[in-house]
């Protein structure tokens, strides 16, 4: 499987436009902070199988679009961004999935490294949370977008490697 | 790679302004926030404030509210401080620096500073 | 403004043992699991240089013998065992609340 250039362009568009969705100033909401607790470990990427690492990614991918596709999200953002940012997302996922039946084959089921998985989940999970208890404030919804840019970061190392592997 | 080169010395007079700038080179110009720094010789450094290239956003510290402005030209990759009513206070190196880990405001690069010297 | 009082001003150490050095802010830089404190490595005629961020993560490329430490108010940079390439100034930062502010440096000269 060879994640193209094509897909790390996908990767910086992502980025891109998270970057042009903040709508507040982030220095007013530094009270707001908060650790998540990144699963970093996870996308070290060293004691993956390249199919693992691939699923962790997919998952990535799969949990920031649930995140950005609620009804409270979809209130914070502009939509014509939100929906680019849909469309790349969508078609990184597609990119994924192509892979890792490509690295496991169609019949078989993906060595899934289930730890790591629910670990993304965990994260997210967390994520959701905090919105929650900060009622989905402007400030709530700008840390986690700085959040998620810098999960998204995370996980297009992790691809950068993957491809150095190939 | 990442690169920040700032313009050179600067020679100036008490009450005169200076308009120094940092060109960018190796990233995406308009999705980090750029600081700036002040050092004084022998002296520790100063947090000036902050801009986001994208949209021009700025954030200052409240001491430097009045002495600086900056500004950024996105079509350059280029970011600018503008520094008025100069007095020897104003005498130091004044450091670009490209905001790192998102709201964490770190800075891992650096230019190699633009030394002003005001004097009359 | 928080002020960041680093100690010592300067110091000495012998090659291979431990420079310890310390930043006290004057109100708490932690919230909500991060603590927002940073080191930097300043040499003369150089930039700063980026060691740690959020008090205990090591900047990636920077040597392992750098480790931070501390939260609220208290924070501390370790460097052991200390190499000749270490004699520097080491300045704390903070991005707890605005305006971020700089500690006034310790110089490590190396015996």
């Known amino acids: 499987c060879n994640l193209s250039q094509t897909h790390s362009l996908n990767n910086r568009r992502t980025l891109m436009l998270m970057a042009q969705m903040r709508r507040i100033s982030p220095f007013s909401c530094l009270k707001d902070r908060h650790d998540f607790e990144f699963p970093q470990e996870e996308f070290d990427g060293n004691q993956f199988q390249k199919a693992q690492a691939i699923s962790v990614l997919h998952e990535m991918m799969q949990q920031t679009f649930n995140l950005f596709s609620t009804k409270n999200s979809s209130a914070a953002w502009d939509e014509t961004l939100l929906e680019k940012f849909y469309i790349e997302l969508f078609q990184q996922m597609n990119d994924l999935e192509a892979c890792v039946i490509q690295e496991v084959g169609v019949e078989e089921t993906p060595l899934m490294n289930e730890d790591s998985i629910l670990a993304v989940k965990k994260y997210f999970q967390r994520i959701t949370l905090y919105l929650m208890e900060k009622k989905y404030s402007p400030c709530a919804w700008e840390v986690v977008r700085a959040e998620i840019m810098r999960s998204l970061s995370f996980s297009t190392n992790l691809q950068k490697r993957l491809r150095r592997k190939d | 790679q990442v690169q920040l080169q700032e313009s050179g010395t600067v020679l100036a007079r008490p009450g005169a302004s200076v308009k120094m700038s940092c060109k960018a080179s190796g990233y995406s110009f308009t999705t980090y926030w750029m600081h700036w720094v002040k050092q004084r010789p022998g002296q520790g450094l100063e947090w000036i404030g902050v801009i986001y290239p994208g949209n021009g956003d700025t954030t200052y510290n409240q001491k430097f509210k009045d002495k600086a402005k900056l500004t950024a030209v996105t079509s350059a990759n280029t970011a600018y401080m503008e520094l008025s009513s100069l007095t020897n206070e104003d005498s130091a190196v004044y450091f670009c620096t490209r905001n790192y880990k998102y709201d964490y405001y770190t800075m891992d690069y650096w230019g190699q500073g633009t030394t002003v010297t005001v004097s009359s | 403004d928080i002020v960041l009082t680093q100690s010592p001003a300067s110091l000495a150490v012998s090659l291979g043992q431990r420079a310890t050095i310390s930043c006290r802010a004057s109100?708490?830089?932690?919230?909500?699991?991060?603590?927002?404190m940073h080191w930097y490595q300043q040499k003369p005629g150089q930039t700063p240089k980026l060691l740690i961020y959020l008090a205990s993560n090591l900047e990636s490329g920077v040597p392992a013998r750098f480790s931070g430490s501390g939260s609220g108010t208290d924070f501390t940079l370790n460097i052991h065992p200390v190499e000749e390439e270490d004699a520097a100034t080491y300045y704390c930062?903070?991005?707890?609340?605005?305006?971020?502010?700089f500690g006034s440096g310790t110089k490590l000269e190396i015996k």
């Open positions: 109100k708490s830089v932690s919230t909500s699991g991060h603590s927002y």
């Open positions: 930062q903070h991005s707890g609340e605005l305006p971020f502010t």
